[in-house]
């Protein structure tokens, strides 16, 4: 694969991943009410990083923002921070990579500068993807922990009125945003790796520019064998890699209703 193609594809994959990270961060369905083995309710709860929502079978949906910083769990704050850092790094990565793209000519910028910028954007995308993956994974771990804790509470006796009155505890499971986040983080990471690979192809090989003296009998001629490498030929530097391009499929929250509780 040519450097231009590798760099371009890396940029596009990173861009898709970055868009996915933004989508996941903004989505309300990070955690959704677990309906398995629960009495079927006419109310469905789901939560995001920024607000929690309730959808009634009537079709009425009410969302409330988390209007406090101090009252929120440290883990939620950490996940928010990781996702925002991922987005910020992604923005910088995109800006840098636009200037680094080989197909775009900006002034007298040489390949060496473009290579450095490509490497920089690649590293930024890798870190951005890692931030998203860690953020989503931390949230998922938090959900799993809370899920089993609430399950234990469920079966450790129902309180109130001598056990006559049952209180149903709302348990939460993985929401669509987690899967979007994982896929998006992965794509951003893959795109970043591709950019780094493209950088290696953009870097001029120093050995091609070294003058070598050959002493022929009776003559003292210094010459450079092979001359300069043509800018399109990369010889052994070319890596034949097959890039698997996945797509982050997202579903709109308000239209996503395929749950056993919901009939609207």
């Amino acid at each position: 694969m040519s450097v231009t193609a590798c760099q371009g594809l890396g940029f596009v994959v990173s861009l898709i991943g970055f868009a996915g990270i933004i989508a996941a961060t903004c989505m309300d369905q990070w955690s959704t009410q677990d309906l398995y083995n629960n009495p079927v309710t006419a109310v469905f709860n789901y939560q995001g990083l920024w607000r929690s929502c309730v959808r009634e079978s009537s079709g009425f949906t009410e969302c409330r923002g988390y209007f406090t910083l101090l009252g929120l769990p440290a883990m939620l704050q950490a996940v928010r921070a990781l996702m925002i850092v991922g987005i910020v790094l992604g923005v910088i990565g995109i800006l840098v990579s636009i200037f680094a793209l080989k197909c775009i000519r900006i002034g007298s910028m040489d390949d060496s500068a473009k290579a450095k910028m490509t490497l920089t954007s690649g590293i930024l995308f890798i870190i951005s993807g890692i931030c998203a993956i860690i953020g989503v994974s931390v949230f998922a771990n938090m959900l799993v922990t809370n899920f089993w804790m609430s399950t234990a509470n469920m079966y450790s006796g129902m309180g109130g009125m001598g056990g006559m009155v049952q209180t149903v505890q709302t348990r939460y499971t993985f929401g669509a945003a987690l899967f979007v986040g994982w896929v998006a983080g992965g794509l951003t990471l893959i795109g970043g790796v591709m950019m780094c690979i493209a950088c290696r192809g953009l870097t001029p090989d120093d050995s091609n520019f070294k003058a070598v003296s050959y002493h022929a009998s009776g003559q003292n001629v210094a010459y450079r064998p092979g001359g300069f490498k043509a800018s399109t030929g990369f010889g052994s530097n070319t890596r034949n890699k097959k890039i698997y391009d996945g797509g982050a499929r997202t579903e709109d929250d308000e239209q996503s209703h395929p749950t056993k509780y919901d009939y609207v």
Epitope: T41, V43, S58, E62
Partner: antibody, heavy 118, light 113 residues
């Protein structure tokens, strides 16, 4: 304004079936659930089930599964409830209602009296 | 199914009197997501369909006089009529709107002395 107009009273024999209609007006029929409620003479209210007119999706009270079948016709903005294998226990007033905030029933039909008698 | 227990089954009142009726559910109707109780109160007069009075346990439907007040949370709910009028004589039902199947209480009948 929102209105639900139900079909007239029915007098039918045991073992037969009856189809009660509920014509909606004054709102987007497909956007709101229609619920059905049974009330026997001098008795309380029983929820039969609901239908989403937009998708045709239904949710029945287990007690009425096999007894009631809920359908809806979007073109005429009408919801239907068919009651089969009727017995004297099915003699009651049947109401249709439109869902509202809090899953409550804000708008009701006038009721259809079904009398099962030999 | 959720059992809704209403008490008393009937109340004899005079005009201007304050009336309180109770409704208890076998499971909590409080949704943790929005901290709302999915309990509804209806009024039914003879030969008429029920009329929505209060939803979310305490939210009065538009057009309902402010003498009607709903309160309570979880499993214990109350409907209060601050000053009963002649037109308030009817049967009052509470309903679970949280769990399927939706269930109604057996009703509290308000009669005049």
């Amino acid at each position: 304004q929102v209105q639900l107009q139900q079909s007239g009273a029915e007098l039918i024999g045991p073992g037969t079936s009856v189809k009660v209609s509920c014509k909606a007006s004054g709102y987007a029929f497909s956007n709101y659930l229609i619920e059905w409620v049974k009330q026997r003479p001098e008795q309380g209210l029983e929820w039969i089930g609901l239908i989403n007119p937009g998708s045709g999706g239904t949710n029945y009270n287990e007690k009425f599964k096999g007894k009631a079948t809920l359908t809806a016709d979007k073109s005429s903005s009408t919801a239907y409830m068919q009651l089969s294998s009727l017995t004297s226990d099915d003699s009651a007033v049947y109401f249709c209602a439109r869902v509202y905030y809090g899953n409550s029933f804000a708008y009701w039909g006038q009721g259809t009296l079904v009398t099962v008698s030999a | 199914d959720i059992v809704m227990t209403q008490s008393p089954s009937s109340l004899t009142v005079t005009a201007g009197e304050k009336v309180t009726m109770s409704c208890k559910s076998s499971q909590s109707l409080l949704n943790s997501g929005n901290q709302k109780n999915y309990l509804t109160w209806y009024q039914q007069k003879p030969g008429q369909p029920p009329k929505l009075l209060i939803y979310w346990a305490s939210t009065r439907e538009s057009g309902v006089p402010d003498r009607f007040t709903g309160s309570g949370s979880g499993t214990h709910f109350t409907l209060t009529i601050s000053s009963v009028q002649a037109e308030d004589l009817a049967v009052y039902y509470c309903q679970n709107d949280y769990f399927y199947p939706f269930t109604f209480g057996s009703g509290t009948k308000l009669e005049k002395k």
